[in-house]
């Protein structure tokens, strides 16, 4: 039961995470104009991975896409790549994890297959989450660097009578969405990996070993191993990962919870 819950929860958390990664990637507010020097600006700038926007106090918003590929900063391209890789891995992970869910029966799929699929999806979710976190962090670092550079420029070159105020950008909502979503996907992946351990059936089924004592035959089963329970054609010897006694549910599955955001 605990394995099923862990796997299911891992799937749901990863799903939320991946949805968040997609949302963050599509959002326009990766960087927003810093309003420290002018909190009542009539023009508000914000930028995303794909376009930049200007919101006027009149109510009009104009967005323009980055129609050049070669003219964009390498860092921005890298962030785009990381986020897309995260999305793709997460999407594949979701697809795999759906079939790996213990509560879903597909033909005569064995527990070992489900365990492998759960582990695969968990790893995909972990990598997906890491990609998202890395992408957002690279962008944040870029913002911090540019912020202090523009601050330095703002206070130099003010010798003339005319002031040219340089627009500085700070963290936008998309960064926080991306960090949280990446974290959720990562956690979901870890949960899926944990669930995989619970799902994996025993490798070795020790047959009852007869010990002749007092002239009686007594079947002795060591505590760390489990005899075949008669589910399916359990002819292979399967080793249980955890030495402790478990319910059938616990042995069968652990929910994995790593989803891409």
């Amino acid at each position: 039961m605990a394995v099923t819950a862990c796997q299911g929860l891992g799937f749901v958390v990863s799903l939320i995470g991946i949805a968040g990664i997609i949302a963050a990637t599509c959002m326009d507010q990766w960087s927003t104009q810093d309003l420290y020097n002018n909190p009542v600006t009539a023009v508000f700038n914000y930028q995303g991975l794909w376009r930049s926007c200007v919101r006027e106090s009149s109510g009009f918003t104009e967005c323009r896409g980055y129609f050049t590929l070669l003219g964009l900063p390498a860092m921005l391209q890298a962030v785009r790549a990381l986020m897309i890789v995260g999305i793709v891995l997460g999407a594949i992970g979701l697809l795999v994890s759906i079939f790996a869910l213990k509560c879903i029966r597909i033909g005569s799929m064995e527990d070992s297959a489900k365990a492998n699929m759960t582990l695969t999806s968990g790893i995909m979710f972990i990598v997906s989450g890491l990609c998202a976190i890395a992408g957002v962090s690279v962008f944040a670092n870029m913002l911090v660097t540019n912020f202090w550079m523009s601050t330095a420029n703002m206070y130099t070159g003010m010798g003339g009578m005319v002031q040219t105020v340089q627009t500085r950008y700070t963290f936008g909502a998309a960064l926080f969405v991306g960090w949280v979503a990446g974290g959720l996907t990562l956690i979901g992946g870890v949960m899926m990996c944990i669930a995989c351990r619970g799902l994996a059936p025993e490798e070795t089924n020790y047959k009852a070993v007869s010990y002749h004592a007092s002239g009686h035959s007594v079947a002795y089963k060591p505590g760390g191993f489990k005899a075949s329970t008669g589910f399916g054609s359990n002819t292979k010897n399967k080793k249980i990962y955890d030495g402790g006694a478990r319910t059938e549910d616990e042995v069968q599955s652990y929910p994995s919870k790593h989803d891409y955001v």
């Epitope: 009539a42 700038n45 914000y46 006027e56 009009f60 002031q163």
Partner: antibody, heavy 118, light 113 residues
Framework: QVTLRESGPALVKPTQTLTLTCTAS????????MSWVRQPPGKALEWVAT????????YYNPSLKDRFTISRDISANQLVLKVTNMDPADTATYFC???????????WGQGTTVTVSS | DIQMTQSPSTLSASVGDRVTITCKSS????????????LTWYQQKPGKAPKLLIY???TRESGVPSRFSGSGSGTAFTLTISSLQPDDFATYYC?????????FGGGTKVEIK
Amino acid sequence: QVTLRESGPALVKPTQTLTLTCTASGFTFSSYGMSWVRQPPGKALEWVATISGGGSYTYYNPSLKDRFTISRDISANQLVLKVTNMDPADTATYFCARQSRGNAMDYWGQGTTVTVSS
Amino acid sequence: DIQMTQSPSTLSASVGDRVTITCKSSQSLLNSGNQKNYLTWYQQKPGKAPKLLIYWASTRESGVPSRFSGSGSGTAFTLTISSLQPDDFATYYCQNDYSYPLTFGGGTKVEIK
């Protein structure tokens, strides 16, 4: 077509409160920022206040102290300006205007002249 | 606050003349986000409400004759009337639409020579 019509008292005594109303028609009132601009006799235009489309944000001319309050009633398509503690220096023609692209004021009312005198 | 300075304050011209009015701002009105200058030009006739001529420093409002054109960037802007018509005798104002408080220039009165 877009029309803006200001209304309010023509004569106000000093220290009294002035309430001006601008009734809009011909456009989606809640989609545009609205402004009040005034012009003392023989002088230049002076921006007074602006309110955002939904009414969430208000902006005021800091040189006019805190006596001005701009608000809007979206259901009635009305823009309101309240000025407390009126002073003879507030004598002017008050215009309401719609903000458009570039924050430019593309439509203006005909203006209402307010005289502050005892 | 951004100060707007217009010159000249009064301009005498004849019908058919090319007229240029300048407007200077104490800070740049160029927005880096869309590379547009938030400067607006208005025309006002005595006893009437102002009329929008040009926004974004150079974009002509619909219905405004093509003889009116705006140019400039950053802190220096000009309004040009290529061939002055009798209907163009009025007062012209520039306005900062980039930063609150929105500020108007002192105005340039174009009168008949």
